[in-house]
């Protein structure tokens, strides 16, 4: 990738990412300096006859740097830290060849869970206030709710009204999704009324 | 049917606020977002941000943080955008867009032209 | 953020000719929505999650891709599909459009 448009690669919390190295064709590459945010994170010198000699500059991300026969950079157990600009310079004896990447870190999105505050109005119909929620949503997490195929809303809420003498039993279901991943929690209308009248009752006895 | 009803036209001088409305009718008002999408003239589309219409809660993008601000009247179904002191480079077509999910812009406002001129 | 790129920028065909138009994204999206636009209107929604016509969109248009490259074709146009129309990511925030190809009467 040039320098002018650096390569976005999203990586998976946890997980390993590649950031691919293209050489430059027929030339013998001097050496080979990889940076992240600006700061030197690897020097590689390529050798025709023996191993290459690699001296890992950065401690912290250090342990868990890797490079591929073509010196590509593997980052493994990624963390969310591990985000941001890295940079490639492959030296060679005529000129210096620039790759540029963006490193986006994802989490797989996990324990999606409803929260509901429903009410019981007079004339029997019930109001769903349902909540939906995962753990650690950033603003790359989308989220709406369903039900029979049709989109009910596109938040993490969903405000609805049921009647259960002249609808069916009804299950609402959220829907969380990211580049990554996606989740799904489903509800019954009739059971969360069921349990809304009973409180209404007792509180009424 | 569900629609958007935007405000009319605003000229306005450098300096100046204006406030943009986007009325909503014919759906639940409260369980869509609404995003605000900005077009310059002879421009692409520039999408600014969107506000929780059931928490009141905005999101920027980065290029819209500061002079301008989504707000919201839920007892009238209405999402304003307010954009405070006034730049020429602030004329532009703003469209208020209904979020369907996974933030596809299924209902749109029919805009309003904002003019910044001196 | 996710930049757009929409090729060709205009799109010179005559009425009955197949036109396809390619939006290339420089990080792997999840799904790509497309708009339609014509001069003095709104943006019209037109294909959602990368190969859903939206309501009351002809059946000559159709919507493929996955990861960085995702493509809008239309079999054979007709007069009304001349407009421009843009690409959109929802994967990441901000949610951003491609700069539009313009589909213009030879």
């Known amino acids: 990738q040039s320098s002018l448009t650096p390569l976005m690669v999203n990586g998976i919390l946890g997980e390993s990412v590649t950031l691919p190295l293209e050489f430059p064709a027929g030339e013998k590459v001097n050496f080979i300096t990889w940076l992240f945010n600006e700061t030197s994170l690897a020097f590689i010198v390529p050798h025709e006859t023996k191993s290459p000699e690699i001296h890992v500059t950065n401690p912290k991300q250090g342990k868990r740097l890797n490079f591929t026969q073509s010196y590509s950079l593997q980052l493994s157990n990624l963390k969310m830290e591990d985000t941001g600009s890295y940079r490639a310079q492959i030296s060679t004896k005529t000129s210096a060849k620039l790759s540029s990447y963006t490193l986006r870190i994802l989490r797989q999105l996990r324990n999606i869970q409803v929260t509901n505050h429903s009410q019981l109005f007079q004339n029997m119909t019930c109001e769903l206030h349902l909540t939906c929620s995962v753990e650690d949503a950033d603003d790359n997490v989308s989220f709406r709710w369903e039900a029979l195929g049709n989109t009910l809303s596109s938040q993490p809420n969903l405000t609805v009204s049921w009647d259960p003498r002249i609808s069916s039993e009804q299950d609402y279901t959220c829907i969380a999704e990211n580049a990554v991943s996606n989740l799904s929690f489903s509800v019954s209308a009739q059971k969360l009324c069921e349990d809304v009248k009973i409180q209404y009752t007792d509180t009424k006895m | 049917q569900v629609q958007l009803v935007q405000s009319g036209s605003e000229l306005k001088k450098p300096g100046a606020s204006v406030k943009v409305s986007c009325k909503a009718s014919?759906?639940?008002?409260?369980?869509?977002?609404m995003n605000w999408v900005r077009q310059a003239p002879g421009q692409g589309l520039e999408w600014m941000g969107w506000?929780?219409?059931?928490?009141?809660?905005?999101r920027y993008a980065d290029d819209f943080k500061g002079r301008f601000v989504f707000s919201l009247d839920t007892s009238v179904s209405t999402a304003y955008l307010q954009i405070s002191s006034l730049k020429a480079e602030d004329t532009a077509v703003y469209y208020c867009?209904?979020?369907?999910?996974?933030?596809?812009?299924?209902?749109w406002g029919q805009g309003t032209t904002v003019t910044v001129s001196s | 953020q996710i930049v757009l790129s929409q090729s060709p920028a205009t799109l010179s065909l005559s009425p009955g000719e197949r036109a396809t138009m390619s939006c290339r994204a420089s990080?792997?999206?999840?799904?790509m929505h497309w708009y339609q636009q014509k001069p003095g209107q709104a943006p019209r929604p037109w294909i959602y999650?990368?190969?859903n016509l939206a309501s009351g969109v002809p059946a000559r248009f159709s919507g493929s891709g996955s990861g960085t490259d995702y493509t809008l074709t239309i079999s054979s146009l007709e007069p009304e599909d001349f407009a421009v129309y843009y690409c959109?990511?929802?994967?990441?925030?901000?949610?951003?459009f491609g700069g539009g190809t313009k589909v213009e009467i030879k």
């Open positions: 867009a209904r979020d369907y999910g996974r933030w596809y812009f299924d209902v």
């Open positions: 014919g759906y639940t008002f409260t369980n869509y977002g």
């Open positions: 506000i929780n219409t059931y928490s009141g809660e905005p």
């Open positions: 990080s792997s999206v999840s799904h």
């Open positions: 999650a990368t190969s």
């Open positions: 959109q990511q929802w994967s990441s925030t901000p949610r951003t």
